[in-house]
């Protein structure tokens, strides 16, 4: 008897972080033997949607014409072949931005920082939130969470970086969200450009979790160091 069918691949275009009102297409790619594709959404009745395969039958398209809160969440897909249903795909987390007003991102003491010194990125919201995310453009692992403990809500979070190296330079944005859905984020803050000077010979900071050996410098997760702020927020890596 043959082993289980290989799991399909699930992805979203143009990406998995979508602004409210924009369109998104979810793709599920299986094998040429696929007869039907099924998309399941966590905490929704299954199946969430079914589609016939597109020629040459190795994938299916699930369209979301206008992103809203209802579509944000965690998805998996399956395909059916003559021998049965496949294993589930790895999950796809579809995140909607624009659920809350944009936070403000500031650099303390300045966005111009000398290599080896310290800088703190400060993300501040108008309303009390329990999760703050710092995102660096063009990073493969861009999400750094500060999440409040015990359900306490905060108006700000500090992301300290010390010592700063060339890797920290770049464009940052922050988001805020509520604990009841980590798939709903605020509008992004205005971008903040962190410029690191005197950093040509800086050593690369060593990440505290493993990443693909094929990863280049921009694929490393951002690694602020220093104590967790006094605000009752806890640091999480995504």
């Amino acid at each position: 008897q043959a082993g289980p069918l290989p799991k399909p691949t699930l992805w979203a275009e143009p990406g998995s972080v979508i602004s409210w009102g924009n369109s998104v297409t979810i793709w599920c790619q299986g094998t040429l033997e696929a007869r039907e594709y099924r998309l399941d959404k966590e905490e929704s009745p299954a199946p969430w949607d079914r589609q016939n395969p597109l020629e040459p039958k190795n994938k299916a398209r699930f369209s979301i014409p206008s992103m809203t809160e209802d579509y944000a969440g965690r998805y998996r897909c399956y395909y059916r072949s003559p021998v049965g249903w496949s294993q589930p795909s790895d999950p796809l987390e579809l995140v909607m931005t624009g659920a809350y007003s944009k936070p403000t991102l500031s650099a303390l003491p300045s966005p111009l920082v000398t290599s080896g010194k310290s800088v703190t990125l400060l993300c501040q919201s108008r309303s009390p939130m329990d999760t703050f995310l710092l995102i660096k453009e063009r990073a493969a692992h861009p999400l750094l969470h500060l999440r409040s403990e015990h359900g306490a809500q905060q108006h700000q979070a500090e992301f300290p970086m010390s010592p700063v190296t060339s890797v920290h330079g770049g464009t940052y944005r922050c988001f805020s969200s509520h604990g009841f859905s980590h798939y709903l984020l605020s509008h992004p803050s205005d971008p903040l450009e962190l410029i690191v000077s005197g950093s040509l010979e800086d050593p690369r900071p060593s990440p505290t979790r493993s990443v693909s050996t094929a990863a280049g410098p921009e694929d490393q997760p951002l690694m602020p160091t220093g104590s967790v702020p006094h605000s009752g927020l806890r640091r999480h890596w995504e």
């Epitope: 500031s106 303390l108 309303s127 009390p128 905060q154 700000q156 500090e158």
Partner: antibody, heavy 118, light 107 residues
Framework: QVQLQQSGAELMKPGASVKISCKAT????????IEWVKQRPGHGLEWIGE????????HFNENFKDKATFTADTSSNAAYMQLSSLTSEDSAVYYC???????????WGQGTTLTVSS | DIQMTQSPSSLSVSLGGKVTITCKAS??????IGWYQRKPGKGPRLLIH???TLQSGIPSRFSGSGSGRDYSLSISNLEPEDIATYYC?????????FGGGTKLEIK
């Protein structure tokens, strides 16, 4: 606990300048905006502007742009507001206030009474 | 600028009773409103923010509600220490603005 201690009452002559201080304790001074608010009898509370001590960024109410200057010293956890070219219209109680993120104003100083009189 | 119209400007109250103070914004402020209590010789004290979130240490007899342009602060079971002047603050806009105040007096 969070406290904002303001400098004492001032009696100034028209045309002079005055610098009001606000000493903060009980929290990380550099990461919270300090707001300045004016209260004149019959005029209610009026927002003058704000400073983020950690980087010196400021925002102003247009009505006070040429009147007020904000500074902060993170080594002593103190914020300052200087008012220039004083007139009788500047006679008021001035408050420094900590702001929660970009949200509400939470902790207020006790107020500094400024009287401008010849 | 967003104008905040607070009413009434003064109110005679009975201890043990309930009062409601209202603030009307000149435009939608998305629930970004705080309520403050001020006593003579002291700085104002934050009671409620984000329309209905009670600030730590504030008794539950204070409550806030509202949406869009219309907001209110209610105080039930009035106690002697509640006699003060109350203000609303909108912080939806880069230029925060206050209501004109409501002075509570004992009947």
């Amino acid at each position: 606990q969070v406290q904002l201690q303001q400098s004492g009452a001032e009696l100034m002559k028209p045309g002079a300048s005055v610098k009001i201080s606000c000493k903060a304790t009980g929290y990380t001074f550099r990461t919270y905006w300090i707001e300045w608010v004016k209260q004149r009898p019959g005029h209610g509370l009026e927002w003058i502007g704000e400073i983020l001590p950690g980087n010196g960024n400021t925002h102003f109410n247009e009505n006070f742009k040429d009147k007020a200057t904000f500074t902060a010293d993170t080594s002593s956890n103190a914020a300052y507001m200087q008012l220039s070219s004083l007139t009788s219209e500047d006679s008021a109680v001035y408050y420094c206030v900590r702001r929660l993120g970009r949200g509400p104003f939470d902790f207020w100083g006790q107020g500094t009474t400024l009287t401008v009189s010849s | 600028d967003i104008q905040m119209t607070q009413s009434p400007s003064s109110l005679s109250v009975s201890l043990g009773g309930k009062v409601t103070i209202t603030c009307k914004a000149s435009q939608d402020i998305n629930e970004y409103i705080g309520w403050y209590q001020r006593k003579p010789g002291k700085g104002p004290r934050l009671l409620i923010h984000y329309t209905s979130t009670l600030q730590s240490g504030i008794p539950s007899r204070f409550s806030g509600s509202g949406s869009g342009r219309d907001y209110s602060l209610s105080i039930s079971n009035l106690e002697p220490e509640d006699i003060a002047t109350y203000y609303c603050l909108q912080y939806a806009n880069p230029l925060p603005t206050f209501g004109g105040g409501t002075k509570l007096e004992i009947k």
